[in-house]
Interface confidence: medium
């Protein structure tokens, strides 16, 4: 028998520095977690103790903090090289700055293979990107070889900016011939490493003949056997065992997100490459693990540029940006409109001639807007200003919801109106009318939504049975501020870009902004 240790991360999202327990900015260092310096300590410890170790990343290193905003992926290549990753799969966020923003900073600079079997380049891009990412890679590990085959969410064109010259194929259809090829090369130990979410990971384990282990990402799935060490609630045991269609037991793993844990999976193979046993658990990278001093020093050196960036002007406002709780928790506020407009703008994807865009709607809890911005400071808007407005380090995510769920959400928005509570919704691509004289749960008297399948966008009545795409803060997608109906009834959830980054990009693009209060939210007293 031959034993392999798989160390894995996924959805690190630019958390190069240690973070608080909830993966936001580290405040009290004695209670902080993760970060590449601490990760390196643990990885090195395991590499020294065990003979056959692979360090793998399942995608979405890009996007999430000011690190990515400033360094645009160069930081990912630099620190992943420093940690000596063995392979990485492409995630959807790796395309956030377009194909060029992937090729130059990461693909050309990485000293490890970057993989995806279901992304096919065409046209002029095919020769430009050739060899910079691969469908699979055979890695020597000790006296053996291990095949790593990559995959990426086929929803990427809707979630990021891969352009028109990359085709995202069905994962299972694309993986099978690559695995078959590895088999013909006498590679009998194969890991599928990819970024399509836990449900697809399980399907790959079930359907793709010859895959021995699946290491996934995208859905931020936390798996754990025994008592979990922090706040995350396990979605299942680690590893999650799937019985394949040909009768094999295939371990599937994922390691939550944000570099908080290091996935640790020990696999035992027989001489024919069959998995005999698999066990392990994610390792919580808490403060009991010291940060490696050389990596930490490097982090501090790179950090200097970030501090300078946060005070630079992004753009100007010629109007007061009213982010006060007195406005945003009671009525339409222009800061809410600005943020929602930025959220929609960030999700413009013209992927279908029938649709002007795939999503037109935004909702945003008023309590998430924490500060106004005064235009009398020469109109200047900086990252620092935006960090005061959006201090929680969240993301703006894409969900799919039924109309009936949206209706419930808007009822919740005003169910205890007048108490300055955070659940009052700011909107984009939505016209809502409330009648506060009616009892809670029955106050939404009109809800019109901007069409997507139209050449001239116009407002249509919400259809209860229809499925809509909506951009919202991850806080709401996770049921925050009492929006349990969103968490319970959402049909799909894809994590998006860092909130501040979305707004700062929009302001930089617009140069001068002047958001108005324009009748998106109205109050009426109806007849009957």
């Amino acid at each position: 028998a031959w034993e392999l240790t798989i160390l894995h991360t996924n959805d690190v999202h630019s958390r190069l520095e240690q973070t608080s327990e909830d993966s936001s900015k580290c405040v009290n260092a004695s209670r902080c977690m993760g970060g590449v310096a601490r990760l390196f300590t643990k990885v090195q410890q395991i590499r020294r103790a065990e003979p056959n170790v692979l360090l793998l990343d399942a995608g979405d290193q890009y996007q999430g903090t000011i690190w990515f905003t400033v360094y645009k992926g160069a930081e990912v290549a630099h620190f992943m090289n420093a940690l000596r990753y063995d392979a990485m799969a492409l995630g959807n966020h790796e395309f956030d700055n377009g194909v060029e923003g992937l090729i130059e900073p990461l693909l050309k600079e990485a000293k490890f293979p970057i993989l995806s079997a279901n992304i096919k380049a065409k046209g002029p891009l095919a020769s430009q990107i050739s060899g910079l990412y691969l469908p699979y890679k055979v890695l020597p590990v000790g006296d053996e070889v291990v095949g790593i085959v990559g995959y990426t969410s086929k929803e990427t064109p809707f979630l990021s900016n891969p352009g028109t010259n990359l085709v995202f194929e069905d994962e299972i259809t694309a993986l099978q011939p690559e695995v078959d090829k590895l088999k013909t090369l006498n590679v009998n130990k194969i890991i599928a490493l990819g970024h399509s979410g836990f449900e697809m990971d399980k399907l790959i384990a079930q359907k793709v003949r010859g895959v021995d282990v699946v290491v996934g990402g995208h859905s931020n799935t936390f798996l754990y056997t025994g008592n979990p060490p922090s706040k995350e609630v396990p979605a299942g045991k680690y590893p999650f065992i799937v019985t394949s269609d040909d009768g094999r037991k295939v371990p599937v793993v994922q390691a939550y997100a944000f570099g908080k844990y290091l996935g640790y999976l020990k696999i035992e193979f027989d001489e024919r490459g069959n998995v005999i046993s698999s066990h392990g658990n994610p390792i919580l990278l808490n403060s009991s693990i010291p940060e490696d001093p050389s990596i930490k020093a490097d982090i501090n050196k790179w950090r200097i540029k970030l501090d300078n960036y946060s005070t630079q002007e992004l753009g100007k406002t010629i109007v007061y940006l009213d982010g006060s709780s007195q406005s945003c928790r009671f009525r339409e506020c222009n800061m809410g409109n600005l943020i929602c407009d930025a959220m929609i703008n960030n999700n413009l994807r013209h992927t279908d001639e029938m649709f002007w865009n795939h999503v037109s709607m935004c909702i945003l809890n008023g309590g998430g807007i924490r500060s106004p911005i005064d235009e009398r400071n020469n109109g200047t808007i900086t990252w620092e200003n935006l960090a005061a407005v959006l201090p929680f380090g969240g993301t703006f995510d894409l969900v799919q919801l039924k109309g009936s769920t949206l209706k419930k959400a808007f009822e919740h928005s005003v169910h205890r109106y007048g108490q300055s509570t955070g659940e009052f919704l700011q909107v984009g691509g939505i016209h809502v009318v409330y009648d506060l004289s009616r009892k809670p749960g029955d106050r939404v008297v009109k809800l019109d939504v901007l069409c997507t399948k139209c050449r001239v966008p116009s407002y249509d009545p919400l259809k209860m049975d229809e499925v809509y795409k909506v951009i919202l803060p991850n806080f709401l997608a996770n049921g925050g501020d009492g929006f349990q109906m969103i968490k319970d009834e959402l049909l799909r959830h894809d994590s998006g870009d860092q909130d501040i980054n979305v707004v700062s990009t929009y302001i930089s693009k617009m140069k001068v902004i002047y958001p108005a209060v324009e009748g998106r939210i109205k109050f009426s007293t109806g007849s009957h």
Partner: antibody, heavy 125, light 110 residues
Framework: EVQLVESGGGLVQPGRSLRLSCAAS????????MHWVRQAPGKGLEWVSG????????GYADSVRGRFTISRDNAKNSLYLQMNSLRAEDTALYYC??????????????????WGQGTTVTVSS | QTVVTQEPSASGTPGQRVTISCSGS????????VNWYQQLPGTAPKLLIY???QRPSGVPDRFSGSKSGISASLAISGLQSEDEADYYC???????????FGGGTKLTVL
């Protein structure tokens, strides 16, 4: 398939009562307001009554107010029209119709996007 | 008597553009949105236009609605024989606190 099927029509003497029913299928019934609309022989459409998704808002045309009662049973996906003190001028084809919205208010007025085939009510001695 | 009025009949030849109008008051058309329904002979009405000018899915773009002041109109371009039907406008009426239909216009395709 979205469908509305009316029943309960028939021949009735003036002053008597009749109860119309409408069975809904193919959509989430309790998400929408519902209406009764009638059409006298050779005449135009006349809105009779409407009811919001949760029965909190109810409206009637002046011509039937006080005599007709609209109700719904969301558990049974059914709409009803109780017609009392019937008159000859109530003779018509009665349609059940689904609203595009859930409310029965001026602010949420869109229109009726699904109609049944109608049930005939004849009031005659 | 009907509070929203329509001309009883209209006609046109195939391929022609026909306009059907609807007149009301400030309490209905003037202050609220207008719908249009088509009723083919012997069938139930069908929603053609809502919110003055919006077409439900499946309604051809030959049908268009507009509203100005206390009047609304339905235009049918490229008239076809299957467009022969009764057309009704409808609106919310503030003074009646309910919905009102126009008297209907019978469209004949010559």
């Amino acid at each position: 398939e979205v469908q509305l099927v009316e029943s309960g029509g028939g021949l009735v003497q003036p002053g008597r009562s009749l109860r119309l029913s409408c069975a809904a299928s193919g959509f989430t019934f309790d998400d929408y307001a519902m209406h009764w609309v009638r059409q006298a022989p050779g005449k135009g459409l006349e809105w009779v009554s409407g009811i919001s998704w949760n029965s909190n808002s109810i409206g009637y045309a002046d011509s039937v107010r006080g005599r007709f009662t609209i109700s719904r049973d969301n558990a049974k996906n059914s709409l009803y029209l109780q017609m009392n003190s019937l008159r000859a001028e109530d003779t018509a084809l009665y349609y059940c119709a689904k609203d595009m919205g859930w409310e029965l208010l001026k602010t949420s007025y869109y229109g009726m996007d699904v109609w049944g085939q109608g049930t005939t009510v004849t009031v005659s001695s | 008597q009907t509070v929203v009025t329509q001309e009883p009949s209209a006609s046109g030849t195939p391929g022609q553009r026909v306009t059907i109008s609807c007149s009301g008051s400030s309490s209905n058309i003037g202050g609220n949105t207008v719908n249009w329904y088509q009723q083919l002979p012997g069938t139930a009405p069908k929603l053609l236009i809502y919110s003055n000018n919006q077409r439900p899915s499946g309604v051809p773009d030959r049908f268009s609605g507009s509203k100005s002041g206390i009047s609304a109109s339905l235009a049918i371009s490229g008239l076809q024989s299957e467009d022969e039907a009764d057309y009704y406008c409808a609106a919310w009426d503030d003074s009646l606190n309910g919905r009102v239909f126009g008297g209907g216009t019978k469209l004949t395709v010559l």
